[in-house]
């Protein structure tokens, strides 16, 4: 069967029907359907005016305008808001009421596209394998990235979050139109990786999506990840404004000027340096979502009541931090180079700057405890990777899972850890699953391009597609049309259970309490440390005028250290795109092509791409109860400060409303709220906060949409902000 022309709100569209073998099965493929009008720079997306006749939807459209990997030119287009649909068809009747899976790509909110990199004429985000193997409709789409998607003055002049609003427009378009393609508009699952996983999470929390989303999967990225929310957007907006010659003294004039500036100039005004970094690499990603008081009405930690009816899977890769650690400390991947205690201490101190000497020393001690027993370079390098994995991915994911569970009504929660090792031939043997390694298996690459893969890779891919599509159908990854290798138990606050995804899966794959000591450290011990003063927190200013070196952070406001965005001649951005591709220069509009397999290693065609999404991680405590973030009563306003902040601030460390603290022991006691920068143990909230939007337990009647005025709503930091 085949669909033929389909009538949508924009008009008729016609795709391609691709036959799948001799049994008569096929897949209808639609590429390049507009879901919004061509964009205007730094404006919200608008509905598409439609067309007459039948739109031939047979080719991917260009990605949204973005810098190339080398950051010296742009590719893509401002006219980029298009989506792609794969609809599986049986032999006789056209499909009806199929579950719908909408993919959101990663790329550090800086790069990427709905189709991903092209390798052997197969695009990374080609939905055919998922659609046909799982009998679901797959949708991918483009959204604006970089300054054009996320530049903000932190006020009404340029509220930001344009890329998130693009994503919402695509989701709403699917809801309104997918029935015509044979989809069930009441069974939409979002899934995404890295910045895409965080976007999935943010979309479930936004009041704009009420009633649109049934289920969600965050792979290596959640809303609470420390790189997701920009707390000082004005700093970054001014950096770009200065570069393109716009006035910076008055936000309204600056905004007007930026809106009429050549979008290519805006895009190239922001560069991510990659060498001579004063701070860890991810602190240089400046154009990301903001708390705008509208689309994201409050700190994400306070919005989980909005996701109370959405089934949720979240997980991380066991070495998600590897690519970032190898950028921050290049010796990690070099057999002939050593990681020293001094190197690691420096890295730790850069992440823990607002806790001063004590923060650095305590963290260093916790992570190097094993070094006395095993001083091998392999162990030391693994420690560095574990450290970045914990901070950027595992801990925030754990908190997100606990928060979802605590607020869920009928919704289910599942956690996973993806551990199938990276197939990058240039990596040391000890490297596990790097950031973005999971994508190729979810999208069925071992089946689509079999020559690059081994049977065990097909086993992993088959299992992941089965779990993911079963979940999309039923809300339970074990139940659906696809057989699974073992039973995946839900995550609960009692069991802290997670499924470890590997090539051999059985009953022992269901595990509990991942990295307990480290989760406890970050959510209890570290947070209780006092925040140091500005002088103590400020490092010695860098010398020289290279724009690659960030201004030293000042103050203890709620932002990560913000480096400059200059055109420093810094090396190109790491492969953080949607492609899962190594740093090979991009070709055409396809994204950087992945390194082909070399020798007999069977290296996969899609290596990791460091697009920085933080995957959710199951609870790691052996405490029984995972950390349920409190909702606090800090009274911080829902809109970030819009003042002329000057140099980039240091991220806060607990004097502004601290991140959640997991209960200890098996007491089942409620979570305690940290109380500022005192050295005493945090005390439980007293409940006089004026009804925070997200209660610590899921049975509350809290309104799903938090206030957007300047009320005293709780504003907890999204995660440990270092």
């Amino acid at each position: 069967a085949k669909l033929g022309a389909v009538y949508t709100e924009g008009g008729f569209v016609e795709g391609v029907n691709k036959k799948l073998g001799l049994l008569g099965d096929s897949v209808d493929i639609f590429k390049g359907i507009p879901f919004a009008a061509p964009t205007k720079a730094l404006e919200n997306p608008q509905p598409h005016p439609g067309w007459q006749g039948t739109l031939k939807a047979k080719n991917f459209k260009k990605r949204c305008l973005q810098a190339t990997i080398t950051q010296d030119s742009t590719y893509g287009d401002e006219d980029c808001l298009y989506l792609n649909i794969w609809v599986p068809q049986g032999r006789k009747q056209v499909s009806r009421d199929l579950p719908v899976m909408i993919w959101i790509y990663g790329g550090a909110f800086l790069m990427g596209s709905g189709h991903g990199a092209n390798f052997l004429n197969n695009y990374l985000y080609d939905g055919e394998e998922i659609a046909t193997r799982g009998n679901v409709i797959v949708v991918t789409f483009n959204y604006r990235v970089g300054p054009l998607g996320f530049l903000s003055t932190g006020d009404a002049n340029l509220p930001g979050n344009y890329g998130l609003r693009d994503q919402h427009m695509a989701i709403a378009w699917v809801k309104r139109n997918i029935a015509a393609f044979g989809g069930d508009p009441n069974n939409i699952t979002l899934f995404g990786e890295s910045a895409g996983g965080a976007s999935v999470s943010l979309q479930t929390l936004s009041p704009y999506n009420k009633g649109l989303i049934r289920r969600a999967i965050s792979q290596s990225g959640v809303a609470l990840s420390p790189w997701v929310i920009q707390k000082n957007p004005l700093f970054w907006a001014k950096k770009v404004a200065e570069k393109v010659g716009c006035p910076v003294g008055d936000a309204a004039r600056m905004a007007q000027c930026l809106k009429v500036t050549d979008p290519r100039a805006l895009t190239l005004a922001y560069k991510v340096p990659l060498a001579g970094l004063e701070y860890p690499m991810l602190h240089y990603v400046g154009f990301v979502p903001v708390i705008d008081g509208d689309f994201i009405p409050a700190d994400p930690i306070n919005l989980y009541a909005n996701a109370a009816d959405i089934d949720y899977i979240a997980g991380t890769n066991n070495m998600d931090g590897h690519i970032f650690a190898s950028i921050d400390m290049p010796a990690i991947n070099k057999g002939n180079k050593k990681v020293t205690e001094e190197d690691f201490y420096k890295l730790v101190s850069e992440f823990t700057i607002t806790k001063g000497l004590r923060g650095a020393k305590t963290t260093f001690d916790v992570y190097t405890e094993s070094w006395a027993q095993d001083p091998s370079q392999e162990n030391k390098k693994k420690t560095v990777v574990d450290f970045e994995t914990d901070v950027l991915f595992l801990v925030p994911t754990e908190i997100a899972l606990a928060q979802h569970r605590a607020n869920a009504k009928s919704a289910k929660t599942y956690a996973y850890l993806f551990s199938h090792p990276s197939r990058m031939p240039v990596y040391p043997k000890w490297v596990g699953a790097d950031h973005a390694d999971d994508i190729q298996y979810v999208f069925g690459k071992p089946f689509a391009t079999p020559t690059g893969y081994r049977p065990q890779d097909r086993t992993v891919s088959k299992a992941m597609i089965a779990y993911w599509t079963n979940f999309a159908k039923t809300g339970d990854p074990n139940m659906g049309d696809s057989a699974v290798p073992t039973h995946w138990e839900p995550y609960t606050t009692e069991n802290s259970g997670y499924l470890e995804i590997t090539k051999k899966m059985g009953s022992s794959s269901m595990k509990r309490s991942l990295r307990t000591n480290f989760l406890r450290y970050w959510t209890l011990t570290y947070l209780a440390l006092p925040t140091v003063t500005d002088q103590e927190a400020t490092p010695v200013p860098p010398t020289g005028d290279s724009e690659a070196t960030p201004v030293p952070p000042t103050g203890d406001s709620e932002t990560a250290p913000v480096p400059p965005t200059g055109d420093s001649g810094a090396p190109p951005v790491p492969p953080t795109g949607d492609s899962g591709a190594p740093p090979v220069p991009p070709t055409g509009d396809s994204g950087a092509p992945p390194v082909p397999p070399t020798g007999d290693s069977g290296a996969p065609p899609v290596p990791p791409t460091g697009d920085s999404g933080a995957p959710p991680v199951p609870p790691t405590g052996d405490s029984g109860a995972p950390p349920v973030p409190p909702t606090g009563d800090s009274g911080a306003p829902p809109v970030p400060p819009t003042g002329d902040a000057g140099p980039p601030p240091v991220p806060p460390t607990g004097d502004s409303g601290a991140p959640p603290v997991p209960p200890t022991g098996d007491s089942g006691a409620p979570p305690v709220t940290p109380t500022g920068d005192s050295e005493t143990a945090p005390v439980p909230p007293t409940g006089d906060s004026g009804a925070p939007p997200v209660p610590p337990t899921g049975d509350s009647e809290a309104a799903p949409v938090p206030p957007t005025d300047d009320s005293k709503e709780a504003q907890m930091p999204a995660v440990i902000r270092f």
């Epitope: 033929g4 008009g11 378009w173």
Partner: antibody
């Protein structure tokens, strides 16, 4: 100027079929979709379906699938709507209506054709 | 399908009055359109894309809204404005509101 002229009133028995025509003039016939909307006596408007005159592609409201067929004749710039298995509740005024532009509203309407279904 | 709920279903007003009719969609929509229909006549396009007026429609008619809530306003009723008004959304399965009958008080 744009004109849509529909065929005259029809009286049909239950179980029969009716075919209503809509002749377009004043614009390029193949450049705009044509919709059919009906209105039962004293009731509101109900969308039935749409046809793209350039390639004959159609889409029908779920309620009418299997009973309605829309066709066009480009040589005479005419679209047709045939409704089969008529029942008394199909008694209504049937309108053809042309898109205004893009995915726009229905900017131009025929005068309507009353179809009465009675035994 | 997307449901459209118009209110009120009928209303009485006098010449010169300001009148407002609302239409709520069961989910967020891209565009809302409004039609005027007089007895025995075909509907006539009044407002398109929420707030735009086709040529020939008097400026006393205006439309506003986005997402799920939309409004048609007649700033100063004229005798020829007494009619039935329909809202209309264009998803892949277009639907109309049930109509608002505007009568002379």
């Amino acid at each position: 100027q744009v004109q849509l002229v529909q065929s005259g009133a029809e009286v049909k028995k239950p179980g029969a079929s009716v075919k209503v025509s809509c002749k377009a003039s004043g614009y390029t016939f193949t450049s705009y979709n044509m919709h059919w909307v009906r209105q039962a006596p004293g009731q509101g408007l109900e969308w039935m379906g749409v046809i793209n005159p350039s390639d004959g592609a159609t889409s029908y409201a779920q309620k009418f699938k299997g009973r309605v067929t829309m066709t066009r004749d480009t040589s005479t710039s005419t679209v047709y709507m045939e409704l089969s298995s008529l029942r008394s509740e199909d008694t209504a005024v049937y309108y053809c209506a042309r898109d205004y532009y893009g995915s726009s509203p229905l900017g131009y309407w025929g005068q309507g054709t009353l179809v009465t279904v009675s035994s | 399908d997307i449901q459209m709920t118009q209110s009120p279903s009928s209303l009485s007003a006098s010449v010169g009055d300001r009148v407002t009719i609302t239409c709520r969609a069961s989910q967020s929509i891209s565009y809302m359109h409004w039609y005027q229909q007089k007895p025995g006549k075909a509907p006539k396009l009044l407002i398109y894309a929420a707030s735009k007026l086709p040529s020939g429609v008097p400026s006393r008619f205006s439309g506003s809204g986005s997402g799920t809530d939309f409004t048609l306003t007649i700033s100063s009723l004229q005798p020829e404005d007494f009619a039935t008004y329909y809202c209309h959304q264009r998803s892949s399965s277009p639907t109309f509101g049930q109509g608002t009958k505007l009568e002379i008080k």
